[in-house]
């Protein structure tokens, strides 16, 4: 149709930052400060600090890590953003009052094995899923 | 060992809120304001709003939804929290300077089908994954 042809021709008028954002083809050159960008940070959790030392036998603690940082427009590809996060970032960029920025959260988590006492004081070895952050991304 | 027995006997001295947090057994009675808790919110995104109307033919827009709200201690089970989020919430509760609270992010996302013009003005029908928030949780 003429409308379709018109729209097809109009595409060159679309702002570059939006054109580049064709769903998952995320702009590489982020304007947000790289030091502040969403990434994995060190965090060692001691079970004593959590007050769990009396029922967890081993380990004494573990490297849990955590995610923190900006998920600002435009998102870099290393930010493991979902298509929804890309759309939300753009909505926030257009009007920050409408939605918050996507948040920096774990995208991959690993398990740890824990030796602990159950309620009957039996010693149990159990694998706890999703305990360690392996990677972070914008969600 | 005597140490183990001692620790086993000491378990009753562990504060209730921490005992209840044995990994994924999350306390049901949240003290944080329910209205502010992490949940799914309405958000309709028109492709015109994003400036994409010249290359997206259909749909005109879609119900994207978004996640927003508090992930405060103790986490309710409906908050779909990972074990890591439970640990992070407790670390934050003990010392807010150490780590941020976990963030409210999509836990389930759905796809949508989009009819659009490619760079050669061909009409393409493509399924874009992770475009619609189906559920939110604390991560």
């Amino acid at each position: 149709s003429t409308g379709s042809k018109q729209r097809s021709q109009n595409r060159s008028k679309t702002p570059k930052n939006q054109e580049a954002l064709r769903m998952a083809n995320v702009a590489e050159n982020s304007s947000s400060d790289q030091r502040q960008a969403c990434k994995k940070h060190e965090l060692y959790v001691s079970f004593r600090d959590l007050g769990w030392q009396d029922w967890i036998i081993a380990p004494e603690g573990y490297a849990a890590y955590y995610c923190e940082g900006e998920c600002a427009f435009p998102l870099n590809s290393y930010m493991n953003a979902t298509n929804h996060a890309i759309v939300q970032t753009l909505v926030h960029f257009i009007n920050p009052e409408t939605v918050p920025k996507p948040c920096c959260a774990p995208t991959q988590l690993n398990a740890i094995s824990v030796l602990y006492f159950d309620d009957s004081s039996n010693v149990i070895l159990k694998k706890y899923r999703n305990m360690v952050v392996r990677a972070c991304g914008c969600h | 060992s005597t140490g183990s027995k001692q620790r086993s006997q000491n378990r009753s001295k562990t504060p209730k809120n921490q005992e209840a947090l044995r990994m994924a057994n999350v306390a049901e009675n949240s003290s944080s304001d329910q209205r502010q808790a992490c949940k799914k919110h309405e958000l309709y995104v028109s492709f015109r709003d994003l400036g994409w109307q010249d290359w997206i033919i259909a749909p005109e827009g879609y119900a994207a939804y978004y996640c927003e709200g508090e992930c405060a201690f103790p986490l309710n089970s409906y908050m779909n929290a990972t074990n890591h989020a439970i640990v992070q919430t407790l670390v934050h509760f003990i010392n807010p300077e150490t780590v941020p609270k976990p963030c409210c992010a999509p836990t389930q996302l759905n796809a949508i089908s989009v009819l659009y013009f490619d760079d050669s003005s061909n009409v393409i029908l493509k399924k874009y994954r992770n475009m619609v928030v189906r559920a939110c949780g604390c991560h």
Partner: nanobody, 121 residues
Framework: EVQLVESGGGLVQAGGSLRLSCAAS????????AGWFRQAPGKEREFVVA???????YYGDSVKGRFTISRDNGKNTVYLQMNSLKPEDTAVYYC???????????????WGQGTQVTVSS
């Protein structure tokens, strides 16, 4: 919470103009879609016009070229300028704020109490 209060309704002759106002309190209006709907006796609530969070305007077919929506963020108020009014524009006009589908009243979370517009021939 957003509280909405409409004003500016009244009786006007066909071909005349009216300006409706919708003042928001409790929270800023600017992050929401601001929509005007109308309801004539015994009829469904009908979409009139919406101003998106992006600043883009969406008009219902029956009011295109006659009605204009605008927003004053400083005053936290949305206006509906109605020109070339027709008797069929007679209805209670409601202002809504939400983030759902702009043409569907179910996409709006907050509503005003409505203001009556009567167009006489």
């Amino acid at each position: 919470e957003v509280q909405l209060v409409e004003s500016g309704g009244g009786l006007v002759q066909a071909g005349g103009s009216l300006r409706l106002s919708c003042a928001a309190s409790g929270r800023t209006f600017s992050g929401y879609v601001a929509g005007w709907f109308r309801q004539a006796p015994g009829k469904e609530r009908e979409f009139v016009v919406a101003l998106s969070w992006s600043g883009i305007t969406y008009y219902g077919d029956s009011v295109k070229g006659r009605f204009t929506i605008s927003r004053d963020n400083g005053k936290n108020t949305v206006y509906l300028q109605m020109n070339s009014l027709k008797p069929e524009d007679t209805a209670v006009y409601y202002c809504g704020a939400g983030k759902g589908y702009y043409k569907d009243y179910r996409g709006y979370d907050y509503w005003g109490q409505g203001t009556q517009v009567t167009v006489s021939s």
